[in-house]
Interface confidence: medium
Amino acid sequence: KSPIFGPEEVNSVEGNSVSITCYYPPTSVNRHTRKYWCRQGARGGCITLISSEGYVSSKYAGRANLTNFPENGTFVVNIAQLSQDDSGRYKCGLGINSRGLSFDVSLEVSQGPGLLNDTKVYTVDLGRTVTINCPFKTENAQKRKSLYKQIGLYPVLVIDSSGYVNPNYTGRIRLDIQGTGQLLFSVVINQLRLSDAGQYLCQAGDDSNSNKKNADLQVLKPEPELVYEDLRGSVTFHCALGPEVANVAKFLCRQSSGENCDVVVNTLGKRAPAFEGRILLNPQDKDGSFSVVITGLRKEDAGRYLCGAHSDGQLQEGSPIQAWQLFVNEESTIPRSPTVVKGVAGSSVAVLCPYNRKESKSIKYWCLWEGAQNGRCPLLVDSEGWVKAQYEGRLSLLEEPGNGTFTVILNQLTSRDAGFYWCLTNGDTLWRTTVEIKIIEGEPNLKVPGNVTAVLGETLKVPCHFPCKFSSYEKYWCKWNNTGCQALPSQDEGPSKAFVNCDENSRLVSLTLNLVTRADEGWYWCGVKQGHFYGETAAVYVAVEERKAAGSRDVSLAKADAAPDEKVLDSGFREIENKAIQDPRLFAEEKAVADTRDQADGSRASVDSGSSEEQGGSSRHHHHHH
């Protein structure tokens, strides 16, 4: 498919000018190659009329130019003094005419309307309002006022001052007679339809002394604005419909076959399933304007979009509308990245987020898409060292691997983490990408103890068990903080005995904290990576308490921090009952509630009475040190 894009149809009137913009991928080759505008012949072939290399056909001499805008990836063809002979099929393209790097454009030049003398022309957009002014003389001040529409050879009454309204105009027309001082009546027609276009006649009085005035109403279908975006990128449609529809429901729809326009999103809460997780309808303003952001653009998103206002939240005759023609360039500069990432409950995910590599210094963000209230995306983490409070200890944004990609790690997963997340930067807004996290059944691969208590001044050793499948990966321990996870020294203790059917390639890697201080309290992660690419992680919260008895602590999966209210299972794993120490931020009445979420958005401040092995992997018992 050609990556060149332009207007499919251009309509104009004899004597007028047109300006045709064609888009191309702004690669360095494309920027400098020949641009052309040619007319398609009846037997194929395309005869150049104008090109960027200076050629101008005699037919266009003195009335056309072609300008390249390499920084935008566009070129513009201007043609003046149009005649009906200019109607036809054209191509705008790059390189040589026959190569196929082009876009077909149909140009239609029509005769101007043959208007009667003394005809006032009203040109109004579809869905808008027109006021037709009709002057009269004093002798007709008390006589009937009327407006007729010329249908074929006959004038058909539209409205009059005695109260008649033509059924085609019911509910959207009125006749106003100005105060006695002004010899003028006006007819106001709202929610204009294409079928309203035509010749009208105002009349005051019905006899030979009546006053008459001709009006020509032209109802314009909005010309679609051309939008050229990259596959996997994003688009924003800004819709400004005017203050008169500020309180009317708004919609964005995509035209399918014929006149059908399928709602993509509206302010009444409707959203097309194909756009779930990748669309935001930004709140409308008093002036009736709003915008819609769509990310993760797909090939099938290309097409004509209309935004409008109607109480039904969908396109109806007479809706004021704005139009766009979206072209999705498949020669995208945005790299492929997984659109779905699967994680096991209790385990973790590492999400790769692409960004424009020219903007390596931009701030990176990650947000969670919410479908409520027309879609919004509360930020969870950024590259400046901020993490939303409910995600402390389990979420990190890393600048690695760099060069156009950053990494987000989320661990201690539960079913509530399933959903759509957006990768953002404060730079190029077209590089907004979406990833869906799905939570699947299974066991975490890494095994760590549940929450651990260290004693001030003593030594603590915390184990992390890696199965054989990670034998070729680098294994690490790190201490989590708002800015990332700082690597710590760790010791390989040899094969692990925590896995059934796992050979010598399994590994037990320990973190040792010598002479524990208060500063050692916090979240620790063990994980695997290959170079700058991160894999699974597991988290452990280490609490620090005053010395009770001398010695050092070697925490194993069994009996880790065993307290009087914990029972050790035969399996060698521990089960923590609902009496375990809770996150101090939780209110007393929440303490025993299983699987609670802080403000329903992501904290795991609960005690699950799941399997002991689940607990070993998920580390859900939060102890925060603020």
Partner: nanobody, 124 residues
Framework: EVQLVESGGGLVQAGGSLRLSCAAS????????TGWFRQAPGKEREFVAR????????DYADSVKGRFTISRDNAKNTVYLQMNSLKPEDTAVYYC?????????????????WGQGTQVTVSS
């Protein structure tokens, strides 16, 4: 969370100008969509202007369009409201607010961080 501090308020004659500043600490302000709101005595707090994190998208209440300009200097971690052709009806406490929602534009409900406010009085 970000802490916001407004300054630049004061007493000014009708037709005069003021420039309000909103300085952020605790976090870079360009994470946020930032807005100015105002509240006159006995009235509800109303939206005045807002600017997105890149500074490329701004929006104004009808009553201040053409007179007020919102801008940001991310290097100084500050958002400004330049108020020209002030009218007595502009008298109010002006608040700066930040939102950690990504939605291009945000509404009042989305502004989670608020400053203490600065008094602007326009005399006739």
């Amino acid at each position: 969370e970000v802490q916001l501090v407004e300054s630049g308020g004061g007493l000014v004659q009708a037709g005069g100008s003021l420039r309000l500043s909103c300085a952020a600490s605790g976090r870079t302000i360009n994470t946020y969509v930032t807005g100015w709101f105002r509240q006159a005595p006995g009235k509800e707090r109303e939206f005045v202007a807002r600017i997105d994190w890149s500074g490329s998208s701004t929006d104004y209440a009808d009553s201040v369009k053409g007179r007020f300009t919102i801008s940001r200097d991310n290097a100084k971690n500050t958002v400004y409201l330049q108020m020209n052709s002030l009218k007595p009806e502009d008298t109010a406490v002006y608040y700066c607010a930040g939102s950690a929602y990504y939605s291009g534009y945000v509404t009042h409900r989305d502004f989670g961080s608020w400053g203490q406010g600065t008094q602007v009085t326009v005399s006739s």
